[in-house]
Interface confidence: medium
């Protein structure tokens, strides 16, 4: 018995179905085939869970959170014991093991390992201004999404003809900040933050209005 090498890992967008592959070769009939799929969740590495079980010609449910969402891709018994997970959740991210036993085949490698990462597009980011908007001040434009896997990067643009930030601006695409030093009237305008990752983008807008000093009455 030899379980085939699995692809290292699989990525799927949240809510989409995932197929976790596991196939094996065996010299014995599939009369005594036992298959267990286990997961070590990323969120709780100390607590492996049973996903689905095939034993004695019957299928058995694993952990309650998988009920109704998991099944073998083909009719069992078979040498392809891949499974599907429907409506993938963030909590499904983890390391999955298929364990195969098919007596009397002694077996070489009887475990297949596949990583599953459930990807989440960035949620609508929150845009805000930090600091005084008085002319000559320094301001920081902040942008962050509550959700997003992999972690989103943030790109700020000024919505004018050039889409360029003012020359005094410095941008941190990881933190989602733009620092604009010594703001002037030219700094005023609409700014857009684009949060993006491997599977999606999301935006927010911010209106920066630089306040000019009030002319003092002389009299």
């Amino acid at each position: 018995l030899e379980v085939s090498e699995s692809p290292g890992s699989i990525q799927v967008a949240r809510g989409q179905p995932a197929v976790l592959p596991c196939t094996f070769t065996t010299s014995a009939a599939l009369i005594n085939l036992n298959v267990i799929w286990m997961v070590t969740p990323l969120s709780n590495a100390n607590q492996p869970e049973q996903v689905i079980l095939y034993q004695g010609g019957q299928m058995f449910d694993g952990a309650p959170r998988f009920h109704g969402r998991v099944g073998f891709t083909g009719t069992m018994p078979a040498t392809n014991v891949s499974i599907f997970i429907n409506n993938t959740q963030l909590s499904d991210t983890g390391t999955y093991q298929c364990l195969v036993n098919n007596l009397p085949d002694i077996g070489g490698r009887n475990i297949g390992v596949t990583g599953l990462t459930v990807l989440v597009p960035p949620s609508a980011p929150h845009c805000q201004i930090q600091g005084s908007q008085d002319i000559g001040s320094d301001v920081i434009l902040l942008c962050s999404s509550e959700e997003g896997i992999p972690r989103p990067t943030y790109l700020w643009e000024k919505l004018d003809n050039t889409l360029k930030l003012p020359p005094t601006a410095t941008q941190d695409q990881v933190q989602g900040t733009v620092t604009i030093r010594n703001i002037s009237a030219l700094s005023s305008g609409l700014y857009q933050c684009v949060a993006s990752n491997a599977i999606g983008t999301s935006t927010c807008l911010l209106d920066l209005q630089v306040i000019s000093p009030q002319p003092r009455n002389i009299g």
């Epitope: 005594n32 267990i36 093991q97 364990l99 002694i106 077996g107 490698r109 475990i111």
Partner: antibody, heavy 120, light 107 residues
Framework: QVQLVQSGAEVKKPGSSVKVSCKAS????????ISWVRQAPGQGLEWMGG????????NYAQKFQGRVTITADKSTSTAYMELSSLRSEDTAVYYC?????????????WGQGTLVTVSS | EIVLTQSPASLSLSPGERVTLSCRAS??????LAWYQQKPGQAPRLLIY???NRATGIPARFSGSGSGTDFTLTISSLEPEDFAVYYC?????????FGGGTKVEIK
């Protein structure tokens, strides 16, 4: 580091039974085959049978079929080997051994051994 | 069952010498053969698996070769701690079987 700790030495009468335990620590217990191998004084190694705890089904050498029972308790990460109808030639050191990687057949971790003496 | 015959049964050598141990199977076991070392009062220790792969932590002086029915364990230069009994074992078929062992003694 995986460790297999076996129960202590036993002296038994012919015709009786002995049950030896093997407690695993430091690794995943359920997924790996645990086998029992015995060694009579001054003799070689003899495989008796084994079990993959997560499946619960054991596999035995024909020679011991009907006389040996191998079980595993996943909750305590402990495997057991019970040998019945003991005779003097069952006097041996009994080892539990964990399969290398995920295979049934090679043993990379061994218990310290349990001496079972069968004597009237 | 598959019978494994080891030869010689014992041999006396000095540290630094090269040693070659043989294991012959009664029928082909492909490359599904392992070698173990056992010292008095200790459990066996896995040296080689699948005929030629060194187990974790095993020094490079130990090497295995062969396939089918004829296998060899070679120790390129004996160290004092290498004097022990060596067993071969097959996993090609049930039951798993071991050879009778070769005792390597200090001359």
């Amino acid at each position: 580091q995986v460790q297999l700790v076996q129960s202590g030495a036993e002296v038994k009468k012919p015709g009786s039974s002995v049950k030896v335990s093997c407690k695993a620590s430091g690794g995943t217990f359920s997924s790996y085959a645990i086998s029992w191998v015995r060694q009579a004084p001054g003799q070689g190694l003899e495989w008796m049978g084994g079990i993959i705890p997560i499946f619960g089904t054991a596999n035995y050498a024909q020679k011991f079929q009907g006389r040996v029972t191998i079980t595993a308790d996943k909750s305590t990460s402990t495997a057991y080997m019970e040998l019945s109808s003991l005779r003097s030639e069952d006097t041996a050191v009994y080892y539990c051994a964990r399969a290398r990687g995920s295979t049934w057949g090679y043993f990379d971790y061994w218990g310290q051994g349990t001496l079972v003496t069968v004597s009237s | 069952e598959i019978v494994l015959t080891q030869s010689p049964a014992s041999l006396s050598l000095s540290p630094g010498e090269r040693v070659t141990l043989s294991c012959r199977a009664s029928q082909s076991v492909s490359n599904y053969l392992a070698w173990y070392q056992q010292k008095p009062g200790q459990a066996p220790r896995l040296l080689i698996y699948d005929a030629s792969n060194r187990a974790t932590g095993i020094p490079a002086r130990f090497s295995g070769s062969g396939s089918g029915t004829d296998f060899t364990l070679t120790i390129s230069s004996l160290e004092p701690e290498d004097f022990a009994v060596y067993y071969c074992q097959q996993r090609d078929n049930w039951p798993l079987t071991f050879g009778g062992g070769t005792k390597v003694e200090i001359k």
